[in-house]
Interface confidence: medium
């Protein structure tokens, strides 16, 4: 079974319990499928590792917000 730090991941069964600095993150996707045991966010890191995270946690929401803004305002 996939755990909090496993790749590739379709469903998440455990969440990472440690914040990940956004500079290590490349993208994210939300998991809302009824086939999965829980709603989740899967972050893909810059080294292509996929990490399951709890969308209810502040740091996860912040990271998604940050990545969204980074796409809108790329580095000059």
């Amino acid at each position: 079974q996939p755990d909090a730090i496993n790749a590739p991941v379709t469903c998440c069964y455990n969440f990472t319990n440690r914040k990940i600095s956004v500079q290590r993150l490349a993208s994210y996707r939300r998991i809302t499928s009824s086939k999965c045991p829980k709603e989740a966010v899967i972050f893909k890191t810059i080294v292509a590792k996929e990490i399951c995270a709890d969308p209810k946690q502040k740091w996860v929401q912040d990271s998604m917000d940050h990545l969204d803004k980074q796409i809108q305002t790329p580095k000059p």
Partner: antibody, heavy 120, light 107 residues
Framework: QVQLVESGGGLVQPGGSLRLSCAAS????????MSWVRQAPGKGLEWVSN????????YYADSVKGRFTISRDNSKNTLYLQMNSLRAEDTAVYYC?????????????WGQGTLVTVSS | DIELTQPPSVSVAPGQTARISCSGD??????VYWYQQKPGQAPVLVIY???NRPSGIPERFSGSNSGNTATLTISGTQAEDEADYYC??????????FGGGTKLTVL
């Protein structure tokens, strides 16, 4: 133990320039983001600028944007702040501080600060 | 940037509980950090991620954050706790915002 030592402060005339340095030791400098925070005499703390651990992104307070430039040399374990077009309101103690995560920029270690005085 | 508001001063008798508030719009959705600064010294982190204590910080320091208000609580306040206290938060684009600071006086 973690040590951050600022230098380069002093008296400068309005419109002048100054370059602050912060020498880091006791930790893996290249793994941490770094910041400058200032404190005007008798006033509160004001965040000035951040730079990511690899130097890839920089962020500035609106009050210094376009005048100040943050940079780092990971081979020398040193953080810099180039301050141009200085104004009287830039007078403050300037602290360098480290942080681990972005965007949760909080400062677990601080230097003792260097005083910048802008006056004619 | 997020605007953080603190009371300018709080007084407490030794041994009593001091509470310092920090308010801002939807602050509970962000992590809040607290620093202690004594005269002539650099700030020291006393609470991170709302309610966590760094190693070396006494257990009498605690934090909470919900709604629009974060609170630093010092239980059994001691004379050595007299200092300025600053709350701090951040934005998604990695800027940091500080509250105006609160001077804690131990009577």
């Amino acid at each position: 133990q973690v040590q951050l030592v600022e230098s380069g402060g002093g008296l400068v005339q309005p419109g002048g320039s100054l370059r602050l340095s912060c020498a880091a030791s006791g930790f893996t400098f290249r793994s941490y983001g770094m910041s400058w925070v200032r404190q005007a005499p008798g006033k509160g703390l004001e965040w000035v600028s951040n730079i990511r651990s690899d130097g890839s992104y920089t962020y500035y307070a609106d009050s210094v944007k376009g005048r100040f430039t943050i940079s780092r040399d990971n081979s020398k374990n040193t953080l810099y702040l180039q301050m141009n077009s200085l104004r009287a309101e830039d007078t403050a103690v300037y602290y360098c501080a480290r942080f681990e995560f972005t965007p949760w920029t909080y400062f677990d270690f601080w230097g003792q600060g260097t005083l910048v005085t802008v006056s004619s | 940037d997020i605007e953080l508001t603190q009371p300018p001063s709080v007084s407490v008798a030794p041994g009593q509980t001091a509470r310092i508030s920090c308010s801002g719009d939807n602050l509970g959705k962000k992590y809040v950090y607290w620093y202690q600064q004594k005269p002539g010294q650099a700030p020291v982190l006393v609470i991170y991620d709302d309610d966590n204590r760094p190693s070396g910080i006494p257990e009498r320091f605690s934090g909470s954050n919900s709604g629009n208000t974060a609170t630093l609580t010092i239980s059994g306040t001691q004379a050595e706790d007299e200092a300025d206290y600053y709350c701090q938060s951040y934005t998604a684009q990695s800027s940091a915002s500080f509250g105006g600071g609160t001077k804690l006086t131990v009577l």
